[in-house]
Interface confidence: medium
């Protein structure tokens, strides 16, 4: 089976405050089985932004229908961006288990927030 790749094609995305940010992420294989999660930042201080299995995440919507079994697009849209949302976002595949374990991470997309146009 093909080795899983997590593709985050945008190195950075710049969005005006108040707008929505789309963060792209696709995977190249359905294996191993397990959820996708999005985090802002890396390491112990990282913040969970979206979890395919949990919720709700009021400001986050998925671009594709992630509940479909064959879905490989895990891009998300974050609404009403504020300066506090700035940071690097990682799309991470987890392997199913008790608990789920981190399997592979995308390269990250840096979100910068511009001042709201007057």
């Amino acid at each position: 089976e093909e080795e899983l790749q997590i593709i985050q094609p945008d190195k950075s995305v710049s969005v005006a405050a108040g707008e929505s940010a789309i963060l792209h992420c696709t995977i190249t294989s359905l294996f191993p089985v397990g959820p996708i999660q999005w985090f802002r930042g890396a390491g112990p201080a990282r913040v969970l932004i979206y979890n395919q299995r949990q919720g709700p995440f009021p400001r986050v919507t998925t671009v594709s229908e992630t509940t479909k079994r064959e879905n490989m697009d895990f891009s998300i849209s974050i609404s009403n961006i504020t300066p506090a949302d700035a940071g690097t976002y990682y799309c991470i595949k987890f392997r199913k288990g008790s608990p789920d374990t981190e399997f592979k991470s995308g390269a990250g997309t840096e979100l910068s927030v511009r001042a709201k146009p007057s």
């Epitope: 593709i7 094609p9 945008d10 190195k11 950075s12 792209h24 190249t28």
Partner: antibody, heavy 119, light 108 residues
């Protein structure tokens, strides 16, 4: 103006080594990911290797993995490609290419340096 | 790995004519596609990125279109400097970054 100047090409025998350099100027070198792209005689462009601005992230094409090593010295604004165990099929013009800061396309290229591997 | 197929391999046209170059991706690359021009003895030059955005300093006779798997580079009226080899490159699926095989635009 951005300038990328490759050097170090030449004629070598199969199995030998060569080190290419790319001297960069006109931009903040350490802020940009850099790549090597090659073009064999009469052929198209082939991506060879990528190194992130900090040097922490590195990728290689399968055709050179285990034989070529990309590196950079940000204090000297220089990109390198160490090529070992050279083969005839490595004969090409090697270009140094600067990535755009948002996406992985190449907005600046050097003129290239020719590497010929022949017995 | 995403394979890019360019067609035709060679395009023979006269100055002033319109050139249409095609690039097909083996899987969707959305709009993450760039076009380059390569003249003999010169460094490749970025023409188009994001499938349709002209790079700085590129004349408006060059235009790009398409998304997903089908892309087109159009040169509305060929000038002498435009006779060269053109490559498409995808930067969605990486690594490896992949290029098409090239289309040579030659004088008829």
């Amino acid at each position: 103006d951005v300038q990328l100047v490759e050097s170090g090409g030449g004629v070598v025998r199969p199995g030998e080594s060569l080190r290419l350099s790319c001297a960069a100027s006109g931009f903040t070198f350490s802020s940009y990911d850099m790549n090597w792209v090659r073009q064999a005689p009469g052929e198209g462009l082939e991506w060879v290797s990528l190194i992130s601005g900090s040097g922490e992230i590195i990728y290689y094409a399968d055709s050179v993995k285990g034989r070529f090593t990309i590196s950079r010295d940000n204090s000297k604004n220089t990109l390198y490609l160490q090529m070992n165990s050279l083969r005839a099929e490595d004969t090409a013009v090697y270009y140094c290419a600067k990535e755009n800061n948002r996406y992985r396309f190449f907005d600046d290229w050097g003129l290239g340096t020719l590497v010929t591997v022949s017995s | 790995e995403t394979v890019l197929t360019q067609s035709p391999g060679t395009l023979s046209l006269s100055p002033g004519e319109r050139a249409t170059l095609n690039c097909r991706a083996s899987q969707s690359v959305y709009s993450y596609l760039a076009w380059y021009q390569e003249r003999p003895g010169q460094a490749p030059r970025l023409l188009i990125y994001g499938a349709s955005t002209r790079a700085t300093g590129i004349p408006d006779r060059f235009s790009g279109s398409g998304s997903g798997t089908e892309f087109t580079l159009t040169i509305s009226s060929l000038e002498s400097d435009d006779f060269a080899v053109y490559y498409c490159q995808q930067y969605y699926d990486r690594p490896p970054l992949t290029f098409g095989g090239g289309t040579k635009v030659e004088i008829k």
